[in-house]
């Protein structure tokens, strides 16, 4: 006859308040004849949880019919779980004895703990935008989970990050825990469309981690590059000067033209285009009237991007004598 083994497969059972917990116990032999009882805790102070033969256990039901002769499954269900139910539960085989049954073998025990899912991670980026090549910090927070063991990972566009620090509080025993992690991310010029992801894995999530995201578009400022060019062709007595503002983010931009230091109020034509990487290009055309112009016309394109200090680019207008003659001819 095979030696009796008491099998309690789960070392830890996480349960939620109000739900039903199933505590598993099977035996490998029916012998010696005698009952299987459930206790919480060990030693003389242990609490009887279920005895098939006697007692009233309104919240406990058996998974199998224990009256069946060859039953080897002594698993039980405990309904309406409360925090008071936490502890380690043991199924214990007794052999029949007199005047009372004698404990024969105990299962290894299943610890019942209250499990609580972590809240959805919230990722917060820096308060102010930063330019590429600089490092920014993102924080990720999740709360209300139990037990304390939890795994947090950071990703940028699917690539795992390593530069982060994580804390789980409190350090001692608690009903629920919180996690806070700060990751340091170096910004790249193409990060307008990038995302950082904080991924939290916990035993209560059954292998389906929670994710919080933040868009680097909220954290990055890509400063523009400026180029001012004079179009070789002219329209009548006007020369078209173009200011190209390239690769900037965010879209917030103010552009002004100055002619020999004087801000020009008149409207200019412009176009805004979005690049594949999420940055923008702005092209502004300024028509300069070249009749009666002196040779020393200096045009300035000034750009104020996202509230930063203005940057500008100058162009000394090249107006040939031939152009002047033509324009003079055209003037009545």
């Amino acid at each position: 006859e095979e030696e009796l083994q008491m099998i309690q497969p789960e070392k830890l059972l996480l349960v939620t308040v109000g739900k039903t917990a199933t505590l598993h116990c099977t035996v490998t032999s029916l012998l010696p004849v005698g009952p299987v009882l459930w206790f919480r805790g060990v030693g003389p102070g242990r609490e009887l949880i279920y005895n098939q033969k006697e007692g009233h256990f309104p919240r406990v039901t058996t998974v199998s019919d224990l009256t069946k002769r060859n039953n080897m499954d002594f698993s039980i269900r405990i309904s309406s779980i409360t925090p008071a139910d936490v502890g380690t539960y043991y199924c214990v085989k007794f052999r029949k004895g007199s005047p009372e049954n004698v404990e024969f073998k105990s299962g290894p025990g299943t610890e019942m703990a209250l499990g609580a899912k972590p809240s959805a991670p919230v990722v917060l980026g820096p308060a102010a935008r930063t330019t590429p090549e600089h490092t920014v910090s993102f924080t990720c927070e999740s709360h209300g989970f139990s037990p304390r063991d939890i795994t947090l990972k950071w990703f940028k566009n699917g690539n795992e990050l390593s530069d982060f620090q994580t804390n789980v509080d409190p350090t001692g025993q608690s009903v629920a825990y919180s996690i806070r992690s700060t990751a340091r991310v170096v910004l790249d010029p193409w990060d307008v469309r990038s995302q950082v992801i904080c991924e939290v894995a916990h035993v209560t999530l059954q292998g389906d981690p929670l994710r919080g995201t933040a868009n680097l578009s909220e954290a990055i400022r890509v400063p523009p590059t400026l180029e001012v060019t004079q179009q070789p062709m002219r329209v009548g007595n006007q020369v078209n000067v173009t200011c190209q503002v390239r690769k900037f983010y965010p879209q917030s931009l103010q552009l002004t033209w100055s002619e020999n230091g004087n801000v020009c109020q008149r409207e200019t034509a412009s176009t805004l285009t979005e690049n594949k990487d999420g940055t923008y290009n702005w092209t502004s055309w300024f028509l300069v009237n070249i009749s009666d112009q002196r040779d020393d016309v200096v045009l300035t394109c000034q750009v104020k991007h996202d509230g930063q200090l203005a940057v500008s680019k100058r162009l000394a207008l090249e107006v040939t004598v031939h152009q002047k003659d033509q324009s003079s001819d055209a003037t009545p």
Partner: antibody
């Protein structure tokens, strides 16, 4: 073959003792308890006592306390019931049975019985 | 001690009849009741254990029910080999006690 084989019929004088044997085969002897039940002629069943084949603990019917002794020999898978100071009303068929319930007591395997006659 | 009272003490019936035997415990015994069949000159045979579980090899025409103090053994369609004496037995606690028996006779 799972069975309980009892010793043969006995005729005893009042005041004598009788020892009935019950040999188990075909199952793990120490895994079960053994009960002894007797039945006087034309009467019902009377439980005499129980013995754990695993550890030898016993529980006897109150009316037989002091006169009955139940033992087991695990090396031979045999249970014994000795009844002393026999009286005429001890005349009965004595059965051994295997006790099979887990939380309770019921008897799924019986010996054929041993007739003990107490007569002067 | 727990007293077991069986009724009737005897019943006359014909083959094919439905026969019901009752057993009452003097105190609650949950479901810890067994039923046995005994034929003259033979050892008892276990029919039902834990009030309603059919012992292996026993025909399905035998059934048991009840809990607490009142229990019933039913033979749904009496067969010739069923004429015998039937005993209930409480297995809840020592001392184990039997009912007085019900003799099922041929009408």
């Amino acid at each position: 073959q799972v069975q309980l084989v009892q010793s043969g019929a006995e005729v005893k004088k009042p005041g004598a003792s009788v020892k009935v044997s019950c040999k188990a085969s075909g199952y793990t002897f120490t895994g079960y308890g053994i009960v002894w039940v007797r039945q006087a002629p034309g009467q019902g069943l009377e439980w005499m006592g129980w013995i754990s084949a695993y550890a030898g603990e016993t529980n006897y019917a109150q009316k037989l306390q002091g006169r009955v002794t139940m033992t087991t020999d695990t090396s031979t898978s045999t249970a014994y019931m000795e009844l002393r100071s026999l009286r005429s009303d001890d005349t009965a068929v004595y059965y051994c049975a295997r006790e099979a319930g887990s939380s309770w007591y019921d008897f799924d395997l019986w010996g054929r019985g041993t007739l003990v006659t107490v007569s002067s | 001690d727990i007293q077991m009272t069986q009724s009737p003490s005897s019943v006359s019936a014909s083959v094919g009849d439905r026969v019901t035997i009752t057993c009452r415990a003097s105190q609650g015994i949950s479901s810890w009741l067994a039923w046995y069949q005994q034929k003259p000159g033979k050892a008892p045979k276990l029919l039902i254990y834990a009030a309603s579980n059919l012992q292996s090899g026993v025909p399905s025409r035998f059934s048991g029910s009840g809990s607490g103090t009142d229990f019933t053994l039913t033979i749904s369609s009496l067969q010739p080999e069923d004429f015998a004496t039937y005993y209930c037995q409480q297995g809840a606690s020592f001392p184990i006690t039997f009912g007085g028996g019900t003799k099922v006779e041929i009408k």
